[in-house]
């Protein structure tokens, strides 16, 4: 807290410039109205300020506006959007696009903070959706953003938003995450041609379904390893050698290198050895020639 | 990594000069507006001068016309001039990149007149 002191002759701001970087705190406090400074916030970013006389600015606002700052104040915060705490940012109501860019801007290169997940929460909740402009702001700025999202959080997103993710944004995300991803993007890329749709679909893959994945298996998409391995174990299971080498095209090779992890160990267990002898890569771990398989959940579910 | 090193600060008597000098390393020196703070005891961080880029320079309104700024690329390194020193202008000396406005922090150099 700044003492309240008189402002020193000639020393009152007629305007907000570089000279004021020369005040003291408690000069800041006495000469710089506070009216002035919220009309010429647009200023202050280009004056370099120590976060100490950022501080005084802050307070000056603060007592002009206890209610929280009206936009065209927050638009201009700059660097004094670093001395916010989220109390502060919850008492805002940020509609426009531009206000939320410029202040993500200031954060730029650095970690989603406290302060940057208030305002992207009050942001997205006063928009009532994830819409595919505020989607594609928020993950050209930290393509985490998506996966940080709660499953509840992404049931919001709308499928004409999926069109702005990137593979990148997918990185991090659980399998609860892409189950609920997955359909959106499937509708989302509905009417692209088999190639083109494998190619949009790839990343989602961690939320598709059995009869997907077996659809998928017959229209020649040649998926990677690397796609195969984030498949959901349950989806893996029941498909049958035929349909992972049709699924894998030249890749089905890889398949050796990764037995001993899941999905692929798995569902190797499921296959008859038989089967997997077909492939010609030495997979081992099959259900032995003569031997029944009987499906204890079919069963369970009968009785 | 950023580092700047004062050195040049040492006690005098008022009325004589004396030139602090700021090493930088780990970043562009050419492209930075650099500035000189100081802090008195039980005080308040105060900016005393800066020097931009371009070599345009301004001060502080209590070390006008004694004090002056500089700058030399090929060394990285700036000067603060101080002549008719005041016992005032006793304090701990730092050099900051503007762009950091961190303002007073770290060692600095002490700067003792007495009367």
């Known amino acids: 807290e700044v003492e309240k002191t008189a402002c020193p002759s000639g020393k009152k701001a007629r305007e907000i410039d570089e000279s004021l970087i020369f005040y003291k705190k408690w000069e800041l406090e006495a000469c710089v109205d506070a009216a002035l400074l919220a009309t010429q916030m647009d200023r202050v970013n280009a004056i370099p300020f120590t976060y100490e006389q950022l501080d005084v600015l802050k307070h000056k606002l603060d007592e002009l506006y206890p209610q929280g700052y009206p936009e065209s104040v927050i638009q201009h915060l700059g660097y004094l959007f670093l001395k916010m705490s989220p109390e502060d940012i919850r008492k805002w109501n940020v509609t426009s696009l531009e206000t939320l860019k410029a202040l993500l801007e200031v954060n730029k290169g650095h970690e989603m903070s406290p302060q940057v997940a208030t305002l992207i929460d009050r942001f997205v909740k006063g928009r009532g959706q994830l819409d595919k402009d505020t989607l594609d702001t928020l993950t050209a700025f930290y393509p985490g953003y998506l996966c940080s999202l709660s499953p509840e959080e992404l049931s919001s997103v709308p499928p004409s938003s999926i069109w702005a993710v990137r593979p990148q944004d997918l990185d991090t995300c659980d399998p609860r995450q892409l189950d609920v991803l997955y359909p959106k993007a499937r509708l989302a890329f509905q009417n692209m041609n088999g190639s083109e749709y494998f190619v949009k679909i790839q990343s989602f893959l961690g939320g598709a379904p059995t009869e997907d994945l077996k659809a998928l298996s017959q229209q020649n998409v040649s998926m990677d390893l690397a796609t195969f391995m984030k498949l959901r174990t349950d989806a893996v299971l029941p498909l049958t050698v035929a349909e992972v080498q049709k699924l894998l095209g030249p890749h089905v090779e890889g398949l050796k290198a990764e037995e001993r992890h899941r999905p692929v160990r798995d569902w190797i267990l499921r296959q008859r050895q038989d089967d997997l002898d077909t492939l010609g890569l030495g997979l081992q771990g099959g259900i032995p020639n003569g031997y029944l398989v009987l499906d204890l959940s079919m069963q369970e579910a009968l009785s | 990594e950023v580092q700047l090193v004062e050195s040049g600060g040492r006690s005098v008597q008022a009325g004589e000069t004396l030139r602090l000098s700021c090493t930088a390393s780990g970043f562009t020196f050419d492209d930075s507006d650099m500035g000189w703070y100081r802090q008195a005891p039980g005080d308040e961080c105060e900016l005393v001068s800066t020097?931009?880029?371009?070599?345009?320079?301004n001060y502080a309104d209590s070390v006008k016309g004694r004090f002056t700024i500089s700058q030399d690329n090929a060394k990285n390194t700036v000067y603060l001039q101080m002549t008719s020193l005041k016992p005032e202008d006793t304090a701990i000396y730092s050099c900051r990149t503007m762009a950091s406005r961190i303002g007073c922090w770290g060692q600095g150099t002490l700067v003792t007149v007495s009367s």
């Open positions: 020097i931009s880029s371009d070599g345009s320079t």
